[in-house]
């Protein structure tokens, strides 16, 4: 039994780090493998993560952590019974993938303006709470070419756009994702999408 693709890990900078790897053949990850992780810190203990299958030869493990600070560094040991398959380390603050925003809502009752709001996925005491910026994706269900991205570079989790920038009388969907420049994070996953019917009064044309 050998590791084909070494574990790579990302942290949500809150309570979970996710490690993925591939074995050299079909593996029952949860029964055959264990990923041990230990904070490099005085009097810390090793903790065990039981991996799940992620495709035939792929495994994924969700490492539970109390919280994360920039100094944290973990040793990782991948075991198959008594055999050490791989040894590595992981610094969560250098591999951050933020949590996805939630509760995306489209408010259509503000004159001819669309107000999109969503929730910051972090509590106020988390460092990332005040460092997230967002990308909002809006697309038409009827026209695949009608696809746009709005970059929200301010901290407030909201976006206002004129309803008239979208076509009237058709359905649109929106989703939002986040990233944090301070830790050079990857983008989060997209939030679940929300749907609305776009309708607004066309201005009278004067001849």
């Amino acid at each position: 039994m050998k590791v084909l693709q070494e574990p790579t890990c990302v942290s949500d900078y809150m309570s979970i780090s996710t490690c993925e790897w591939k074995m050299n053949g079909p593996t029952n990850c949860s029964t055959e493998l264990r990923l041990l992780y230990q904070l490099v810190f005085l009097l810390s203990e090793a903790h065990t993560c039981i991996p799940e299958n992620n495709g035939g030869a792929g495994c994924v493990c969700h490492l539970l952590m109390d919280d994360v600070v920039s100094a944290d560094n973990y040793t990782l040991d991948l075991w198959a019974g008594q055999q050490l398959l791989w040894k590595g380390s992981f610094k969560p603050s250098e591999h951050v993938k933020p949590r996805a925003p939630g509760n995306l809502t489209v408010h259509t009752n503000v004159s001819d303006t669309l107000l999109l709001t969503w929730s910051n996925p972090y509590p106020p005491d988390n460092y990332l709470y005040n460092h997230l910026t967002y990308a909002v994706n809006i697309w038409s269900e009827n026209d695949p070419a009608d696809f746009r991205i709005y970059n929200v570079t301010y901290l407030e989790p909201s976006l206002r756009i004129a309803a008239s920038t979208l076509k009237s009388g058709i359905s649109y969907r929106a989703r939002v994702r986040a990233w944090a420049q301070c830790y050079n994070t990857t983008w989060s996953e997209w939030s679940p999408s929300t749907k609305w019917h776009n309708s607004y009064r066309e201005p009278f044309e004067q001849h």
């Epitope: 919280d67 600070v69 944290d72």
Partner: antibody, heavy 125, light 112 residues
Framework: EVQLVESGGGLEQPGGSLRLSCAGS????????MTWVRQAPGKGLEWVSS????????YYADSVKGRFTISRDNSKNTLYLQMNSLRAEDTAVYYC??????????????????WGQGTTVTVSS | DIVMTQSPLSLPVTPGEPASISCRSS???????????VDWYLQKSGQSPQLLIY???KRASGVPDRFSGSGSGTDFTLKISRVEAEDVGFYYC?????????FGQGTKLEIK
Amino acid sequence: EVQLVESGGGLEQPGGSLRLSCAGSGFTFRDFAMTWVRQAPGKGLEWVSSISGSGSSTYYADSVKGRFTISRDNSKNTLYLQMNSLRAEDTAVYYCAKDRLSVTVRPRYYGLDVWGQGTTVTVSS
Amino acid sequence: DIVMTQSPLSLPVTPGEPASISCRSSQSVLYSIGYNYVDWYLQKSGQSPQLLIYLGNKRASGVPDRFSGSGSGTDFTLKISRVEAEDVGFYYCMQSLTSPYTFGQGTKLEIK
């Protein structure tokens, strides 16, 4: 009431051995790291050794490394310090102390918040 | 090893007056923001040491609020706002970020 009670001290000749014990009560003993600190007569405090809650991690002062062994029996809520090859400079009052909560991924530190009454070790011929 | 240096080593104080003890570490004991691994202990004559302050500025349970700790990185201070007769004894700072834990030499607080 959270309490630590040391025992096992006494008079021993240079080169001899002693085993100190520290019985814990009033807290979940296995969840906490434990530490030994000593104090030579008329001197300040000196850290001796520490052990994590499960016993998997141990640390020693250079002055005792290779001679002293820290261990614990969580089923008996007891901490030990096996002292071999004793020297005159090991003469001191030995205290055990409750250290950080070590079952969490990052050990949670609240200081050495409970200390035993101390047990006296005298090494003399 | 991290060396902890206390000053003064002797501190005569009039009851009701404030007192301050300094502790300097030879390297930073800051792990992350809010986590300075420095404690302060008081050892009264014939007794075991007792914890006063942990993580630089957190008062231990049951410790009177006249005791406070401050500082970050390498420089730390224990302050007693109004010294009482029962506060006499030896005060020690200690770092517990890395092994070996190291103590300051101790400061003897006595009543004038």
